[in-house]
């Protein structure tokens, strides 16, 4: 795969992943009411990082924001922080990678600068993806713990009042946002890795092991090794450099925008 293609594909994959991370962060369905083995209720509860919602069979949906910071579980705060850090790093990664794209010429920026920027954006995307994956996984772990705790409570009869009145404990299971977050984090991570791989090909290493040849009068050609130039260590293949005339031009102009999916 050519450097341009690898870099471009890495950028697009990261962009899709980043859009997914934003979508997952905004979605309300991080946890949804567990309907299995439960009395069928005419009310469906689901929760996000920022608000909890209730959808009635009447079609009426009511969402309430978490207007407190102190009263929220530390784990939820941590997940919020991880997702926001992931988004911030993703934004920086996108901005850096736009300037690093081989198919865009900006001023007199040389390939070594583009290589460094590509590596930087790749690392940013990798960290962004990891943040999202960790955030979603922490939330999922919290759900699993709470699920089994509430299951134990249901079967130990803690909800009942003297055995006369039954109360139904709402149990929550994985919501769509978790799956979106995992996939998005994975895509961002993969895109970042591709950007790092593309960086190898962008490294100006044509001076590595350069040999100087000269002709001695009537003698055979002799070779003398030139001075060894320290390289990035990513390889020593010399690449042909394409030069694009004109201003900044992109091969990928379309940008995917995150859409918030809401139950109606």
């Amino acid at each position: 795969m050519s450097v341009t293609a690898c870099q471009g594909l890495g950028f697009v994959v990261s962009l899709i992943g980043f859009a997914g991370i934003i979508a997952a962060t905004c979605m309300d369905q991080w946890s949804t009411q567990d309907l299995y083995n439960n009395p069928v209720t005419a009310v469906f509860n689901y929760q996000g990082l920022w608000r909890s919602c209730v959808r009635e069979s009447s079609g009426f949906t009511e969402c309430r924001g978490y207007f407190t910071l102190l009263g929220l579980p530390a784990m939820l705060q941590a997940v919020r922080a991880l997702m926001i850090v992931g988004i911030v790093l993703g934004v920086i990664g996108i901005l850096v990678s736009i300037f690093a794209l081989k198919c865009i010429r900006i001023g007199s920026m040389d390939d070594s600068a583009k290589a460094k920027m590509t590596l930087t954006s790749g690392i940013l995307f990798i960290i962004s993806g990891i943040c999202a994956i960790i955030g979603v996984s922490v939330f999922a772990n919290m759900l699993v713990t709470n699920f089994w705790m509430s299951t134990a409570n249901m079967y130990s009869g803690m909800g009942g009042m003297g055995g006369m009145v039954q109360t139904v404990q709402t149990r929550y299971t994985f919501g769509a946002a978790l799956f979106v977050g995992w996939v998005a984090g994975g895509l961002t991570l993969i895109g970042g890795v591709m950007m790092c791989i593309a960086c190898r090909g962008l490294t100006p290493d044509d001076s590595n092991f350069k040999a100087v040849s000269y002709h001695a009068s009537g003698q055979n050609v002799a070779y003398r090794p030139g001075g060894f130039k320290a390289s990035t260590g990513f390889g020593s293949n010399t690449r042909n450099k394409k030069i694009y005339d004109g201003g900044a031009r992109t091969e990928d102009d379309e940008q995917s925008h995150p859409t918030k999916y809401d139950y109606v």
């Epitope: 005419a42 009310v43 069979s57 009447s58």
Partner: antibody, heavy 118, light 113 residues
């Protein structure tokens, strides 16, 4: 304004079937559930089931499964309830109602009296 | 199924006096997601369909006089008519709107003493 108009009273023989209609107007028919309620003479209210006119999805009270079949026709904004294998205990006033906030029934049809008599 | 039990079965109250009807459910009708109780109250006069008075246990339906009020949470609910009027003579039903199948109380007949 929201209106639910039900079909007229019916007198049926035991073992036969009856189809009661409920024509809705004044709102987007597909967007709200239609519920059916039975009230036997001098008795209380009993929920039969509901239909989502948009999707055609139904939910029945176990007691009325096999007895009642609820359908809806979006083109005419009409919900139907068919009662099969009629018996004397099916004699009642049947109401259709539109769901509202809190899953409550804010709008009701005028009721259809079904009399099962030999 | 959820059992809704109303008390009393019938009630005679003087005009202008307070009338109180109780309703108990066999399971809590409180939804933790929005902290709302899914219980409705209806008024039915002879030969008429029921009329919605209260939903979410305490929210008055538009057009319903403010002498009607609902209260309670979980399994115990109350409908109160603060000052009985002649037109309030009817049968009152509470309804579980939380669990399928939706179930009604047996009804309370309210009369004037």
């Amino acid at each position: 304004q929201v209106q639910l108009v039900q079909s007229g009273a019916e007198v049926k023989k035991p073992g036969s079937s009856v189809k009661v209609s409920c024509k809705a107007s004044g709102y987007a028919f597909s967007n709200y559930l239609i519920e059916w309620v039975k009230q036997a003479p001098g008795q209380g209210l009993e929920w039969i089931g509901l239909i989502n006119p948009g999707s055609g999805g139904t939910n029945y009270n176990e007691k009325f499964k096999g007895k009642a079949t609820i359908t809806a026709d979006k083109s005419t904004s009409t919900a139907y309830m068919e009662l099969s294998s009629l018996r004397s205990e099916d004699t009642a006033v049947y109401y259709c109602a539109r769901v509202y906030y809190g899953n409550s029934f804010a709008y009701w049809g005028q009721g259809t009296l079904v009399t099962v008599s030999s | 199924d959820i059992v809704m039990t109303q008390s009393p079965d019938s009630l005679a109250v003087s005009l202008g006096e307070r009338a109180t009807i109780s309703c108990k459910s066999s399971q809590s009708l409180l939804n933790s997601g929005n902290n709302k109780n899914y219980l409705a109250w209806y008024q039915q006069k002879p030969g008429q369909p029921p009329k919605l008075l209260i939903y979410w246990a305490s929210t008055r339906e538009s057009g319903v006089p403010d002498r009607f009020s609902g209260s309670g949470s979980g399994t115990d609910f109350t409908l109160t008519i603060s000052s009985l009027q002649a037109e309030d003579v009817a049968v009152y039903y509470c309804q579980n709107d939380y669990f399928y199948p939706f179930t009604f109380g047996q009804g309370t007949k309210l009369e004037i003493k």
